[in-house]
């Protein structure tokens, strides 16, 4: 019967007795740069070239013994896990090894960086199809090797790593943290997060996704024939590399932004048990189980979105955070979290010829969130519309006044460090949704949007009494761009889009105790594209 | 239920070239091996080869490399083994059968090809 | 190559009485990483094709007679067939399926004395 974890990257549609995809990822190359391999074992054999690239540190201990088999262990799983014939993701795929660990599993900094510049020279001496770097191995935090990594990809490269198995935030791995890369983190047969010994699968807003990585069976370099099981994020990036390979076999032109914004949008969404990871973790982590998408064809009509968080920006006084989108991404808008619900808001500010979003702390808080909404949005041209503080007590409002152009987000920022719970809540005037709305203390900014198609609509969700959490989604069919709350709420701790449902959330209830102040309203914008609609239905 | 018929029984000359067929049904044919295993008149069994239908990978034994030929096709859920160039010595039982990733046992066998070859 | 020896060559055992085939390979067919031996044993009687008995060594397939049991570990492996039949009357054979090539043993005959 079919692996258990072969079964939970299917799409329903496909489920049977074995595991047979529509496509084996037959026009992709997968370098998979790892210990050596057993390359003649009858699951790779044929299917993984094994490269003259070899770049180990010398094994630990004077007693230590070679044992081929155990050199040729890791890497001989993870080549199956990805393209083996009977227990691989990507059944069709071709694979290169590069040797970058010894027989204990360690490698250097540099011997990874040596292996991704081979790659670099390989893809320009021949270049062939789309290209799928797979990177089981995790170290400390590196900014060398994180901007190798950022190299390769600009260059068109897919890069797939494990969050690492130390139980700790992903961001303080490398390549774990390069934000060009497609990190993974591993989940069991019961969507749980990885235990591993005391330790466990990384988690974090480095992690992009997860994937299955306890009990994985596959290739065992014991013998010709043997499989075993092994376990860790390792494991779980091979089947990201299988599931990337096969998606861009399906669509060879795919960016790396487009196969991210892929890979999120189909996977199993809320699965987690987020329990296991710590409180603060929890927020950031996304809730994500990779699987295929249920047809290799025709998902180009989707507006495809997705949630980046920033780092933590610190507790001093002014403190900012950045979170960024990826170059082929458009910023379609900015929201801001603190836990102690301390903070200045958020703005969207241009950075670099490129739009970025900007949270403020303010004094006395813990530090603050940035939150991306970070979308594909093929010919748009976004720009953003602010409103300076206004004297009116009606608030201060700014709208979308170019012609053909859409609200896609509303962000606040104000200067003073507290705006005092005795102000009341502005309502937003009806009939009027394409306008943002805040604090007659703030500054207002509006993300106006102009792209082929492109509609939205703003969808709201109040509570009158207090809440800790206040949600509001967005319909079959349209896509969440932008996540805020209405004023008036001083309690707010922030807002932010977890998949198309933009959560709002407060202070503990029990510490505010329920005032005319406790309501609580969550504004979604929702949009969609005809154009890409249109598109994807001419190609058919 | 799962079975592997073969072809008929063939009597050759020297020198000609046959193709000898296997048609498994009954299960997936693409996700198992099928193996060609050789029994000479009164002796004991010889592993020749094994392909996989999925994507026809096919490993040989050293002894039998070159000398014989193993394909699949999975459109028809047949394997085949066959001779360019038969020999007296080619004169054998030849059975076929599968195997799995997770049982590398010949669990099914087909019934048997008996090939003569004779002047 | 791995080297599978059978002993005896033939056996002849009386009915009800038990049998003892033994088959020794020539390097280890055990496995640590899932602690398995790969080893089976087939029975093939004449003018039929050989019949799975005893695949990882001690697991009998389903449908086979628990008369029929395989023990052993490493290099040395043994086909007990505990009560004879008249129907076990067959050549039996010894496999490692570890390695390529695939190898059998020479056959071991079973006759009723």
């Known amino acids: 019967s079919i692996p258990w974890n072969l079964e939970r990257i299917t799409p329903p549609r496909y489920r049977a007795d074995e595991y047979q995809p529509p496509d084996g990822g037959s026009l992709v190359e997968v370098y998979l740069l790892d210990t050596s391999i057993q390359s003649d074992h009858r699951e790779i054999e044929g299917r993984v070239m094994v490269t003259d690239f070899e770049n180990v540190p010398e094994e630990d201990g004077t007693r230590f013994h070679r044992q081929a088999s155990k050199c040729d262990s890791h890497g001989t799983h993870l080549a199956g896990v990805v393209s083996g014939r009977d227990a691989g993701v990507a059944k069709g795929a071709s694979m290169r090894s590069l040797r970058v660990l010894n027989c204990q599993g360690k490698g250097t900094v540099s011997g990874t960086l040596i292996g991704l510049e081979f790659i670099r020279k390989s893809q320009l001496v021949q270049p062939v199809g789309p290209l799928v770097v797979l990177l089981p191995l995790a170290g400390g935090y590196s900014r060398v090797l994180n901007a190798a990594c950022q190299r390769l990809a600009r260059a068109g490269v897919v890069l797939v790593t494990a969050a690492g198995n130390f139980r700790d935030d992903a961001c303080l791995y490398s390549p774990a943290s390069a934000p060009e890369v497609i990190t993974v983190g591993a989940t069991n047969a019961q969507d749980q997060p990885v235990t591993l010994g005391t330790l466990g699968t990384n988690f974090g807003r480095c992690v992009d996704l997860f994937a299955p990585g306890e009990d994985i069976i596959g290739a065992s370099s014991d013998c010709s024939t043997c499989f075993v099981s092994q376990s860790g994020t390792s494991q779980a990036a091979a089947h990201v590399a299988g599931i990337a390979a096969m998606m861009l076999s399906a669509e060879p032109e795919l960016t790396l932004a487009e196969l991210r914004q892929r890979l999120i949008h189909f996977s199993a969404k809320d699965v987690i048990n987020e329990a296991w990871f710590p409180e603060d973790q929890r927020v950031l982590t996304p809730n994500l189980v990779a699987a295929l998408p249920p047809s290799t064809h025709g998902a180009g009509w989707q507006l495809f979105c997705r949630t980046v968080w920033s780092a933590h920006s610190g507790p001093t006084r002014m403190a900012t955070a950045v979170a960024r989108c990826a170059p082929d991404e458009e910023l379609l808008s900015c929201s801001s979290f603190s836990r102690s619900g301390k903070r200045r808001g958020e703005r969207m500010e241009a950075q670099g010829g490129k739009l970025v979003c900007r949270a403020h702390n303010a004094f006395g808080g813990e530090g603050v969130y940035a939150i991306a909404r970070c979308c594909l949005l093929p010919q748009a041209n976004c720009s953003v519309h602010t409103a300076p503080p206004a004297e009116a007590s009606m608030g201060t409002r700014v709208h979308c006044h170019q012609q053909g152009h859409v609200l896609t987000g509303c962000s606040s920022h104000w200067e003073v460090e507290d705006l005092g719970t005795h102000k009341p809540p502005v309502l937003r005037p009806r009939g009027q949704p394409n306008q943002c709305v805040g604090h007659r203390e703030a500054s207002i900014h509006a993300s106006c949007c102009h792209a082929p198609g492109l509609e939205c609509k703003v969808k709201e969700h109040g509570i009158p009494a207090p809440q800790e959490q206040v949600t509001v989604a967005c319909e079959e069919g349209w896509t969440l761009t932008g996540c805020s709350a209405l004023p008036g709420t001083s309690h707010v701790l922030g807002a932010y889009a977890v998949d198309n449902t933009c959560v709002v959330r407060s202070r503990d209830v029990s510490t505010t105790g329920s005032t005319s102040e406790g309501a609580v309203t969550a504004v979604a914008i929702c949009c969609r594209s005809r154009h890409l609609a249109q598109a994807s239905q001419e190609l058919q | 239920q799962v079975q592997l018929v073969q072809s008929g029984a063939e009597v050759k000359k020297p020198g000609e070239s046959l193709k000898i067929s296997c048609k498994g049904s009954?299960?997936?044919?693409?996700?198992?091996?099928i193996t060609w295993v050789r029994q000479m008149p009164g002796r004991g069994l010889e592993w020749m080869g094994i392909?996989?239908?999925?994507?026809?990978?096919?490993r040989y034994n050293p002894k039998f490399q070159g000398q014989v030929t193993i394909s699949a096709d999975k459109s028809i859920s047949t394997a085949y083994l066959q001779w360019s160039s038969l020999k007296a010595s080619d004169t054998a039982m030849y059975y076929c059968?599968?195997?799995?990733?997770?049982?590398?046992?010949?669990?099914?066998w087909g019934q048997g090809t008996l090939v003569t070859v004779s002047s | 190559d791995i080297v599978m020896t059978q002993s005896p060559d033939s056996l002849a055992v009386s009915l009800g009485e038990r049998a003892t085939i033994n088959c020794r390979s020539s390097?280890?067919?055990?496995?640590?990483?899932?602690?398995?031996?790969?080893l089976a044993w087939y029975q093939q009687k004449p003018g039929q094709p050989p019949k799975l008995l005893i695949y990882?060594?001690?697991t009998r397939e389903s449908g086979v007679p628990d008369r029929f049991s395989g023990s052993g570990s490493g290099t040395d492996f043994t086909l007990t067939i505990s009560s004879l039949q008249a129907e076990d009357v067959a050549v039996y054979y010894c496999?490692?399926?570890?390695?390529?090539?695939?190898?059998f043993g020479q056959g071991t005959k079973v006759e009723i004395k």
């Open positions: 059968a599968r195997d799995h990733w997770s049982k590398p046992f010949s669990d099914v």
């Open positions: 496999q490692q399926y570890s390695s390529f090539p695939i190898t």
């Open positions: 990882w060594a001690s």
């Open positions: 009954g299960y997936s044919f693409t996700n198992y091996y």
């Open positions: 390097q280890s067919v055990l496995y640590s990483s899932n602690n398995k031996n790969y």
């Open positions: 392909i996989y239908p999925g994507d026809s990978y096919t």
